[in-house]
């Protein structure tokens, strides 16, 4: 038999790691292996998540908490709780339906995930390009040429013929 110290609904007495077993006179049965209950008063235990294939275990399941997964090297997590693993690409690339593709001219990606984003248009902020952009890096904007009085800075402004953000190929 099972003794409890509660006059309430017997199920409210069941702590995390157990479930209120209606098939057995509402006793608090421990969660079976590979299942868990993270809060008290539960009528079932949830099945532990299994990190298989491209997923790997970051935190093991226990009777009171679910397993947590991350992704094997070469992949990264997407979605709440790492519900999906997506293939990594190199910096300067983005993942398409056909695989990893280089960023188009005028765009960059400085991570192994995500999409290529347009270079910053320095002229929109009234600035000039200090460092040209690449597939892997955004442009670096500097002060506008008008802000630079002679002798005030050693920075050489870029050639005026070039469009903002362009990188020599």
């Amino acid at each position: 038999f099972e003794r409890t110290r509660s006059l309430q609904d017997p199920c409210s007495n069941c702590p995390a790691g157990t479930f209120c077993d209606n098939n057995r006179n509402q006793i608090c049965s421990p969660c079976p292996p590979n299942s868990f209950s993270s809060a008290g008063g539960q009528r079932t235990c949830d099945i532990c998540r299994q990190c298989k294939g491209v997923f790997r275990t970051r935190k093991e399941c226990s009777s009171t908490s679910n397993a947590e997964c991350d992704c094997t090297p070469g992949f990264h997590c997407l979605g709440a709780g790492c519900s999906m693993c997506e293939q990594d690409c190199k910096q300067g690339q983005e993942l398409t339906k056909k695989g990893c593709k280089d960023c188009c001219f005028g765009t960059f990606n400085d991570q192994k995930r995500g999409i290529c984003r347009p270079w910053t248009n320095c002229s929109l902020d009234g600035k000039s390009v200090l460092v040209n952009g690449t597939k892997e890096r955004d442009v670096v904007c500097g002060p506008s040429p008008a802000d630079l009085s002679p002798g005030a800075s050693s920075v050489t402004p870029p050639a005026p013929a070039r469009e903002p953000g362009h990188s020599p190929q």
Epitope: F1, E2, R3, T4, R5, N13, C14, P15, A16, G17, T18, D21, R24, N25, I27, C28, S29, P30, C31, P32, P33, S62, S63, T64
Partner: antibody, heavy 122, light 108 residues
Framework: EVQLVESGGGRVQPGGSLRLSCAAS?????????PCWVRQAPGKGLEWIGC?????????YDAQWTKGRFTISRDNSKNTVYLQMNSLRAEDTATYYC?????????????WGQGTQVTVSS | IQMTQSPSSLSASVGDRVTITCQAS??????LAWYQQKPGKAPKLLIY???TLASGVPSRFSGSGSGTDFTLTISSLQPEDFATYYC???????????FGTGTKVTVL
């Protein structure tokens, strides 16, 4: 070192009481580790006495035959579990083992103490 | 829950295949453990969840079964395997953790 150490055994007269202790070291009792008591009379098999939830709740799981004579309790601050035995009889003479019932091992007893001897005799 | 083991004892030789059975009085799914005990020593967990080998246990030990009928098999008996073996239900509550009656394995 991960271990369980029982103490408190000895000789007691019929009708007497005894409290056994089981101190855990190297791990803490929790919702994943329930402390249990098992006994073995001389030349006989293993007999399950009961277990207590390893966390902060007082839920106990007891064998029917204990009939309230045996009570399991726990002191989390000392990481120790107790077996209070009352109205002892000659047939309670046995080696009493403390064991850890582990969720990770399908609630099997994956760690056992060395046992403490209880003799009920006048 | 009552657990009945058979045989209660058996004699065998090194290298023999040994099978011990355990029957539960009601279904316990796969919630069964097997232990080995040597004289004067505490039991040692061999198998849990009916068929999962405990850490450090040689692969010659295996378990099977579900529901009410379970089996422990030693594929090739070794000198250190002469001992008493117990099954235990790990189905908590209502006397759910009862041990089997034990099987003593001795040298033929």
């Amino acid at each position: 070192e991960v271990q369980l150490v029982e103490s408190g055994g000895g000789r007691v007269q019929p009708g007497g009481s005894l409290r056994l202790s089981c101190a855990a070291s190297g791990f803490s009792f929790s919702a994943n580790y329930y402390p249990c008591w098992v006994r073995q009379a001389p030349g006989k098999g293993l007999e399950w006495i009961g277990c207590i939830y390893g966390g902060s709740s007082d839920i106990t799981y007891d064998a029917q035959w204990t009939k309230g004579r045996f009570t399991i309790s726990r002191d989390n601050s000392k990481n120790t579990v107790y077996l209070q035995m009352n109205s002892l009889r000659a047939e309670d003479t046995a080696t009493y083992y403390c064991a850890r019932s582990a969720w990770y091992s399908g609630w099997g007893g994956d760690l056992w103490g060395q046992g403490t001897q209880v003799t009920v005799s006048s | 829950i009552q657990m009945t083991q058979s045989p209660s004892s058996l004699s065998a030789s090194v290298g023999d295949r040994v099978t011990i059975t355990c029957q539960a009085s009601q279904s316990i799914s796969n919630r069964l453990a097997w232990y080995q005990q040597k004289p004067g020593k505490a039991p040692k967990l061999l198998i849990y969840s009916a068929s999962t080998l405990a850490s450090g246990v040689p692969s010659r030990f295996s378990g099977s079964g579900s529901g009410t009928d379970f089996t422990l098999t030693i594929s090739s008996l070794q000198p250190e395997d002469f001992a008493t073996y117990y099954c235990q239900s790990t189905y908590y509550g209502n006397d759910g953790n009862a041990f089997g009656t034990g099987t003593k394995v001795t040298v033929l």
